[in-house]
Interface confidence: low
């Protein structure tokens, strides 16, 4: 395990005094209730805090909200409740913060039952001022900003109307009725499903998918018999009912729904579901639920068109529709994902992939750790990570795994060491190489966060008792120092730092409780004086990502290229700074067959890297196309794995084949496509 506070640890000198001078307490003049916190913009230092307190009366619930604003990363707060006319804000809608640094904020107010519509408060200057606007409808969802233009908003009403505003919520227009789900696409496009007969629930599987590219002036029906739809990366997915039974199947479009292809995925029955686990512009991870109430399914990874899928992982834990899965994108290293599988004996085990789902393996056992009671062999076992599923099961796991793109290689997670996840109290483990190797970082469950792009890690012990101590490390979790941030312990409720892990400020939230009152309190600690100087060239070292065999010329090659990073030395105590940019040097690898997946009509026999011709089946489902409709498809049998950048080497080109009699999508024939004007 990691060394403690002994001679191996280079302690930060005078850190108590340095931190004491940079610890800021704010007591909120509030009854406890609930609190929500939002950062407004990036690197602005603006934080909005909304506290709400419900007073249940005999006939109705009376609510009180208070709004506070900080512009110095939480060191000081000002009560700005008067800017929203002391109105009770609906916390279920949260604070709708605009994209990028637009400075836009929308708060949705609670209104009395008989009113014609809802009420919102709008700010476009980082919450310095708010404008009250009465709505011509009662909102069902939070206002959704167009990613391209923060003046464009959409919302669904309680009567299933689709409402759009073109002037940041000043004026609203209902562009369609009977709408179930609406989403912004790219280029200010709106996709939505509508029902014709009864309701969203009654018409599930008989919905139509519509598109408007001009904010409701004109519409195009782009799908029928729709169960649901989703957007991921550049892909538009629709789950479509089959003609002859109650199964449904995924269809994919990469041109905003003008043309569709049937995804080569299994169809699912009424009790099953599909879930997009992760998507980018290259590819998609798709979970397909197993029949029956198994709690697991299969992960498939797509090609660059989102059409051809390869089985990636069997028995993938995913409890029910909208339930829990541990699938986690490790953002600190390209190609790495962690998730859980449900083994045959119903134990839960953690798996990791380093090549975007190509191969999965167990996590390596941390050095100097012992296998727990779940292990059959006390010398051979793996690390198993606690994530969403463990949290949902109320295990003693306060936080999901954490990684940040600018803290290269760092992954922090709760875990246990054995043959499967243990229900015993977990410890906190850290990897500094993107999940290849692990070390015990802290004994017992903790809250943790990354500051200054990995230069500092902060942790607080998870306890039912009041706390007043924070732990921090400047060497990626090897050595820890403790700082008592207050004499009076508080009931801890959360750790908050600015998203992006570039800040050096951490806010500790909690409440104090006396005989009569409970008050919200925050402590914001600035670590700038701990990291006294800016990092220089000598503070960084070259690190080859995904390196497993330094002797091998292709060492570090993942998806056709390797990357060398400049990483902060563990022994360097210095500031990366807010403007820190990850320095990486990519180099292209030679192609091997591993850089290609098999195209539609081809497959890889077990333990073989060559793609050979496939029976004329539609993916894996049953309309085997024995006597199916013909489709003209030319292929050489291989397609480059999405995102793979290899060059030279193996070039698996064979003669171009005409594959006929492949099943095609009858999802929406051209004659059914129509355009409508409003």
């Amino acid at each position: 395990s990691a060394p403690g506070e002994d001679e191996e640890c280079g302690r930060v000198r005078d850190f108590v005094a340095k931190l004491a001078n940079n610890t800021h307490q704010h007591v909120f003049d509030d009854l406890r209730g609930s609190v929500s916190l939002s950062w407004v913009g990036d690197s602005t230092g603006v934080i909005l805090v909304l506290t709400t307190f419900h007073v249940p009366l005999v006939i109705m619930t009376f609510g009180q909200s208070k709004l506070y604003r900080s512009e110095d990363y939480g060191k000081n707060f000002k009560d700005i409740t008067d800017l929203i006319n002391n109105t009770f804000i609906r916390t279920e809608f949260g604070m709708a913060i605009g994209p990028e640094n637009s400075g836009k904020v929308v708060l949705t107010a609670e209104v009395s039952g008989g009113s014609r519509g809802g009420r919102i408060f709008r700010s476009s200057d980082f919450a310095k001022n708010f404008v009250q606007t009465d709505l011509p409808f009662h909102p069902l969802t939070q206002m959704m900003y167009s990613p391209q233009n923060s003046d464009y908003l959409l919302a669904l009403s309680t009567e299933n109307g689709l409402w759009v505003s073109k002037n940041f919520g000043g004026k609203w227009e209902e562009i369609h009725k009977a709408v179930c789900l609406a989403k912004w696409g790219s280029d200010n496009t709106i996709f939505f499903t509508t029902y014709a007969n009864g309701s969203c629930k009654a018409d599930l599987g008989a919905l139509e998918l519509w598109r408007t590219s001009d904010l409701g002036k004109s519409f195009k029906t782009i799908g029928v018999k729709i169960y649901s739809f989703g957007l991921g990366g550049r892909f538009l997915f629709a789950s479509v009912m089959a003609d002859k039974d109650t199964t449904r199947r995924i269809h994919v479009s990469t041109d905003q729904g003008d043309t569709w292809s049937m995804a080569q995925l299994p169809s699912v029955g009424q009790e099953q579901f599909y879930s997009i686990l992760a998507a980018n512009d290259d590819m998609v991870f798709m979970h397909v639920d197993e029949p029956g109430d198994t709690g697991f399914g299969t992960i498939f990874t797509s090609d660059d068109r989102g059409i051809v899928y390869s089985k990636s992982l069997d028995r993938h834990l995913y409890t029910t529709t909208g339930g829990e899965t541990d699938f986690t994108n490790v953002t600190s290293l390209r190609g790495v994902y962690i998730t859980s599988v449900l083994s045959e004996d119903n134990s839960i085990q953690t798996m990791i992939t380093f090549d975007q789902g190509g191969r999965w393996t167990h996590l390596r056992k941390p050095e100097n750790s012992e296998c727990d009671a779940t292990a059959k062999n006390k010398n051979e076992c793996s690390l198993h990570i606690h994530a969403s599923y463990s949290i949902s099961q109320k295990l003693n796991v306060p936080m999901a795994p954490l990684s940040e793109p600018n803290a290269v290689g760092i992954v922090i997670a709760h875990g246990s060491v054995g043959d499967a996840i243990s229900v015993m109290v977990p410890d906190v483990y850290i990897s500094d190489d993107g999940g290849y190797s692990w070390t015990k970082m802290l004994e017992g469950p903790h809250y943790y966060t990354i500051l200054d792009s990995g230069g500092i890690i902060v942790a607080i012990e998870h306890s039912s008792r009041p706390i007043n101590v924070i732990k921090f490390s400047t060497d990626e979790g090897q050595c820890w120092q403790t700082y008592t941030f207050t004499r009076d312990p508080i009931y801890f409720t959360g750790l908050a730092s600015e998203p992006g892990a570039r800040s050096m400020n951490i806010s500790i939230w909690g409440f104090t409780e006396s005989f009569l009152t409970a008050q919200w309190v925050s402590y914001t600690i600035d670590f700038k004086d701990i990291l006294e100087r800016n990092c220089e060239e000598k503070d960084y070292t070259i690190w080859l990502a995904h390196s497993t065999d330094p002797e091998d010329y292709e060492d570090g090659c993942i998806l056709g290229y390797k990357e060398q990073f400049l990483r902060l030395r563990k022994s360097s105590v210095c500031q990366n700074g807010r403007d820190y940019v990850v320095t990486k040097q990519p180099s292209i690898c030679l192609c091997s067959l591993e850089d290609f997946l098999c195209d539609f009509g081809y497959y890889r026999p077990e333990n073989d890297s060559k793609c050979v011709e496939q029976p004329e089946l539609k993916g894996h489902d049953l309309e085997f196309c024995l006597y199916g409709r013909e489709e003209h498809l030319t292929t050489n049998g291989y397609r480059k794995i999405p995102g793979d950048k290899c060059q030279g080497g193996v070039n698996p080109v064979r003669e171009v084949k005409d594959l006929k009699k492949k099943c095609t999508s009858n999802f929406l024939s051209p004659e059914k496509q129509n355009s409508k004007s409003n």
């Epitope: 299994p266 029956g292 089985k311 890889r604 077990e606 029976p615 004329e616 894996h620 309309e623």
Partner: antibody, heavy 129, light 107 residues
């Protein structure tokens, strides 16, 4: 344990229909496809078709197209094979067999055939005037 | 449809000897091939799937090999319970098809 139990022997007249049942137990019924295979006296095995218990979709061998109907009842974990317009050459033992082809195939990139791993005991159908 | 041809039709072997059964496909079936054993009055039993993988509970004396169009089932040392009819079956292209069978009898 995993079992497929078929209905009893049948004697039919030419032109009639026969419906054979196959009840599955010991595994999740909807997790595997089901094939039907027949064997005429002293002859080899002949594949008739396959059904997906999830949606009930089917695929039949060309030879039986129009005469065979495969159905399933998920509430009782039973599949049925009905053969109509019987003739004397349809006299055979009819087997249902669990066929994991659908579960094994992971889309075009990694299809792998697992074989018909569990068979029913067989149902003898005799067609005679 | 893909035609599966088995040879020989009958194979006479003494107990303890090696038996080699052949199966040929009219076009490539890759490794989507299974072997079954059938004894009189019984249902077939899966021996080999994926051309070379032994099914659960099948003794190690049974092995399968081949890919594409040519496949072999080998019984390294015949036991008395191995005398039966053996069928190969392809599942590469619908309809699934069986070979005509090879009868392994006692010499």
């Amino acid at each position: 344990q995993v079992q497929l139990v078929q209905s009893g022997a049948e004697v039919k007249k030419p032109g009639a229909s026969v419906k054979v049942s196959c009840k599955a137990s010991g595994y999740t019924f909807t997790s595997r496809y089901m094939s039907w295979v027949r064997q005429a006296p002293g002859q080899g095995l002949e594949w008739m078709g396959i059904i997906n218990p999830v949606g009930g979709s089917t695929s039949y061998a060309q030879k039986f197209q129009g005469r065979v109907t495969m159905t399933r009842d998920t509430s009782t974990s039973t599949v049925y094979m009905e053969l109509s317009s019987l003739r004397s050459e349809d006299t055979a033992v009819y087997y249902c067999a669990r066929d994991p082809s659908g579960i094994a195939a992971a889309g075009p990139a990694s299809r792998y055939y697992y074989g018909m791993d569990v068979w029913g005991q067989g149902t003898t159908v005799t067609v005679s005037s | 449809e893909i035609v599966m041809t088995q040879s020989p039709a009958t194979l006479s072997v003494s107990p303890g000897e090696r038996a080699t059964l052949s199966c040929r496909a009219s076009q490539s079936v890759s490794s989507n091939l299974a072997w079954y054993q059938q004894k009189p009055g019984q249902a077939p039993r899966l021996l080999i799937y994926g051309a070379s993988t032994r099914a659960t509970g099948i003794p190690a004396r049974f092995s399968g090999s081949g890919s594409g169009t040519e496949f072999t089932l080998t019984i390294s040392s015949l036991q008395s319970e191995d005398f039966a009819v053996y069928y190969c079956q392809q599942a590469r292209l619908g309809p699934w098809t069986f070979g005509g069978g090879t009868k392994v009898e006692i010499k």
